[in-house]
Structure formats: structure tokens, C-alpha cells
Interface confidence: low
Amino acid sequence: KKVVLGKKGDTVELTCTASQKKSIQFHWKNSNQIKILGNQGSFLTKGPSKLNDRADSRRSLWDQGNFPLIIKNLKIEDSDTYICEVEDQKEEVQLLVFGLTANSDTHLLQGQSLTLTLESPPGSSPSVQCRSPRGKNIQGGKTLSVSQLELQDSGTWTCTVLQNQKKVEFKIDIVVLAFQKASSIVYKKEGEQVEFSFPLAFTVEKLTGSGELWWQAERASSSKSWITFDLKNKEVSVKRVTQDPKLQMGKKLPLHLTLPQALPQYAGSGNLTLALEAKTGKLHQEVNLVVMRATQLQKNLTCEVWGPTSPKLMLSLKLENKEAKVSKREKAVWVLNPEAGMWQCLLSDSGQVLLESNIKVLPTWSTPVQP
């Protein structure tokens, strides 16, 4: 008996060939001996089976002795043994129809679980192997689960169902709803304008939801809602914004926030959350702000940074074109009685400068100038 695997919703063509290369009488029946279709001379005739409106053949092939049965929009319950009767012979074909569906939705939030469920006919014992867009293989039986979806899991998942040494392939497009970056850090000198951008890693026709930026300033004991906003068909409208700081928000995607000026009291980390309509859970992006200030008070030249800095970052004070006078893995460095000239305060990571602030130290009889 020949075995053919089919996919739910797809079309399958079961072949039946006669030795005579001409149009002769044939019939296709199911295992209950109910006629599906056949011919009456050069006409196609259909029987009383449940496949009536979904069954067809190719009349153009009859003259060559080929009498296929085409079943459209396959259903799991179409799985059966189909019998072709031609020239006093019977050809049997076992059709097994499988379906593979993603749980609830193919648009899932980052961190959520993807469950793929295999629908299979009674009596079958298939195995399934899926390959994610990032090349990860998952094997299973009736269900396959992938927990903690990552951004790289967005794309086409290719799943192969194996039964009786035959295989059928499914392709499922999964969209992982997430921000492009899980976390970002902005380094700014005191007084500079700060731009926070929150690009999304997906595109959808209509995007509706609401969001909020909570901010935990390094100096504050508790976090604070800096801004709340709505998103309607990709249009952004601010609902509420604190007076200090007074953030500005772009009206279009990507989500874009502007802090008029970086100040030590704003240094810290924020969490932008976006709740999308008809989705449980939220998208998150962490954003960090590091602020630098260089000051000269009497005979003390000080450079300080505020905000979430890693312990491996180096803060140094140096006179332009000279070796660093002081370098420490700390958040404040200073030089007593600095000599006149242009001093640079540098925050660096393995030699790469992340933030720089210049301060001009004048001879002792005058006051400092900050360029």
C-alpha cells in the first residue's frame, strides 16, 4: 500500500495509472466503498462522499491512462485509504493528513512561549522536528514548546513531520514582538540634550497600545513615572508627563523621547513598557543615563559621573595632550591646584572614550571657563 502525507488546508494529488494509454473507465472509492468520483465516457462523475465538493481529477491526463484524485482544502478527517479501480485492478493509497498550528497567535511577545501543536489522524505515530530561524532544532511528538522566545526567533519556522519514512514540511511565520535592543545606555555631559530612542523590531499594519517610562534616578529612593502615552495606528499621543523633567515625545514611530538637558539628578535607569492591544504582557526596554560634570572650585578640579556605570569604566582627568594626571575606577576624580590649560575629563572603557568634558583652568588670578 502506497502512503501519501498531506497538509491540512493544502491540496493533494493521488495517482492511479492504467497500462492502456487511453481513457477507460475508473472509479475512486474510500475505505467504506463509497464512490468519490469516476468517469462516464469523457465526463467526470461524482459519488455521494463527503469529499464531493472538494474532489476533482485531471481530465487532460485520462487519454494517457492517468486518473488522479485531487482533494482540495484537506482536513485531518480526510485521512483514509483511497482505492482506485481501473482495468479490473485495485490500487490502494493511504492518505495521512497532518496539521501544525501555533498556539493562539503567531505574533508573540519576547519572553513568551511558543507552542506548536500537531494534529494527526488516529492510529498515526508521527515525529516532529522544527528548525527555528536561528538554526535551533526542537523535537517532539504532538506538541512542541519553546519557552522564552528571543528576537532571533522571529521569522519562518520549518517543521518536518515524519511518518512511515515519509515526510511533510510545514512553514510557520512567527513574529516576536520586541524592541530592537533590550537595553541601551546614553552618556551625556551635564546640560546636553538627551535623546532616547526605542525602535521596534517588527512591523505590523496597525499598532495600538499604551506605554509608560518609569525612571529610577540614582539619587531617588523610589522610581517615578516620567511619561505615559497612547499609541493608535502608529500615532503617538502623550497622556501625562512630569513637570520635572518635562520630556518631549515624537508623534511617530519609532518611539522617541527628548530630555531637554542632562542633569545629575536625572542620571539613572528607566524602563519603557509598551502594552499592545489584544496582547497579554508587555514589551520592555531598559534605558540608562550617565551624566558627567567637570567643575573647578577654588583649588580643586573635580570630575564626577552619575548613573549606572560598570566597575571597569575608567574616569580620568588630564591636561590636553599630556598623560592622565589621575585615573580611577571610581565615579569622581579630582586634582588639587591644577595647572592652567585645557583639562579633559574622560570616561572610558578599555581605552575607548565614552564621554568627555573639557574645562579651561585659567591662571590662579582668574576664574575657570567651561567651553
Epitope: E212, W214, S222, S225, T228, Q243, T273
Partner: antibody
Framework: QVQLVQSGAEVKKPGASVKVSCKAS????????LSWVRQAPGQGLEWMGI???????NYAQKFQGRVTMTRDTSTSTVYMELSSLRSEDTAVYYC???????????WGQGTLVTVSS | DIQMTQSPSSLSASVGDRVTITCRAS??????LNWYQQKPGKAPKLLIY???NLETGVPSRFSGSGSGTDFTLTISSLQPEDFATYYC?????????FGQGTKVEIK
């Protein structure tokens, strides 16, 4: 639309503890802070403390050591436990969504706690 | 702690009257001030946030002003449903503190 539903009235003896719950629905629970405010009979409003989205707490000095605020994200519920109760703790206890500068915009219906021997 | 002092503690007014309630902070709180309305047996309701911003759904007869230490809540034309107790609250720093309340009664 965010809604906060609190547990029912309680009668306690002095020295006992009370645990009031506040269940949130219709919003993104994990993204906002909740404050607890109490009101003694015929008196004004008194802030007790706040629990942040991360679970961090900030209590008013007056209640430090007697109050504990916790949150259970799986049930979208925040709890306020007050121990060593005395008669002056008789009050209506409210939970409220605290947006920081923009104030407490959503309030629970209140839970009356009576402390009496 | 920041002390909030409201005045008057109570007032009698008629429907249609213009009513003004003041709130004074013991230190500069910029505009971090909110106003609430509370009716007997009910939870407080946010009216004004950040000193002058009207909360969604609150009638436009309510308005707030002030900055620093002195703030005002004004009801331009008192309606029957406005008879209640009003509280100011600072959100400048913890502990958050409320004024003692102003009861608006029918004359």
C-alpha cells in the same frame, strides 16, 4: 480601565496583625506603583508607604518596622500587613495607583480595620 | 517631612458660588501638588495633578494654580455634587503628605 479591589473589613484585637489585599485588574499591573493611604474615623488622609513596580518599598517613618508591603505579580495583587495593632490604627485603609508626580489616579474602595479589645 | 496646610478647614457656600481653597507647603515643592475630592464613605478622587492639570473626566469648573509653596484650588461655579472634602497632597518627596482637608458645606 484599571480597577483596584480590596479585601473585606476586619476586626482585630490590640497586638494582632492585619493583612489587607488589593487586587488590580484591567491594566498592566507590573508597570505601576501602589501607595497605601489610611483614614481614621473623621480624620484626614495619611500616607503609609509605596511599593514600586520592582517590588521595592518606601515606608513612612511612622510605620517603619510595623508595616510590610508585598506584591504578587501572578495574581496582580498587592498586600499591606500592619502588625502590633493598637486602637488608634482603627481606620479605612486604601490602596491607590501612584503615578508619581501625577498623583494617585485610581483608588481601591477601602478596607475598614477595627482594632478593639 | 513636608507639612501641608490647607485653609479654610471648612466653608459654607451656595450653588453657583466661586470657591477658593488654598494649600501651603512648608518648603518649595515646585508644582508637585495634587488635589483630591472625597465624599463621605467613598475613596478620594484625583481632580488636579501637577498643580494645574485637570485629570481626565473632571469638569472644567475645577482649576488649580500655584507653584513653590502656595497653591489654590478654584471651583468657578459650585454645583450640588461638589459638596465634599478637598485635600491637597505633595508628590515632591516621601513621605507623601496631605493637607488636613477643607470641607465644603451647603450654606
Amino acid at each position: 480601565q484599571v480597577q483596584l479591589v480590596q479585601s473585606g473589613a476586619e476586626v482585630k484585637k490590640p497586638g494582632a496583625s492585619v493583612k489587607v489585599s488589593c487586587k488590580a485588574s484591567g491594566g498592566t499591573f507590573s508597570s505601576y506603583a501602589l501607595s497605601w493611604v489610611r483614614q481614621a474615623p473623621g480624620q484626614g488622609l495619611e500616607w503609609m508607604g509605596i511599593i514600586n513596580p520592582s517590588g521595592g518599598t518606601n515606608y513612612a517613618q511612622k510605620f517603619q518596622g510595623r508595616v510590610t508591603m508585598t506584591r504578587d505579580t501572578s495574581t496582580s495583587t498587592v498586600y499591606m500587613e500592619l502588625s502590633s495593632l493598637r486602637s488608634e490604627d482603627t481606620a479605612v485603609y486604601y490602596c491607590a495607583r501612584d503615578l508619581g508626580d501625577p498623583g494617585m489616579d485610581v483608588w481601591g474602595q477601602g478596607t475598614l480595620v477595627t482594632v478593639s479589645s | 517631612d513636608i507639612q501641608m496646610t490647607q485653609s479654610p478647614s471648612s466653608l459654607s457656600a451656595s450653588v453657583g458660588d466661586r470657591v477658593t481653597i488654598t494649600c501651603r507647603a512648608s518648603q518649595d515643592i515646585s508644582n508637585y501638588l495634587n488635589w483630591y475630592q472625597q465624599k463621605p464613605g467613598k475613596a478620594p478622587k484625583l481632580l488636579i495633578y501637577d498643580a494645574s492639570n485637570l485629570e481626565t473626566g473632571v469638569p472644567s469648573r475645577f482649576s488649580g494654580s500655584g507653584s513653590g509653596t502656595d497653591f489654590t484650588l478654584t471651583i468657578s461655579s459650585l454645583q450640588p455634587e461638589d459638596f465634599a472634602t478637598y485635600y491637597c497632597q505633595q508628590s515632591y518627596s516621601t513621605p507623601l503628605t496631605f493637607g488636613q482637608g477643607t470641607k465644603v458645606e451647603i450654606k
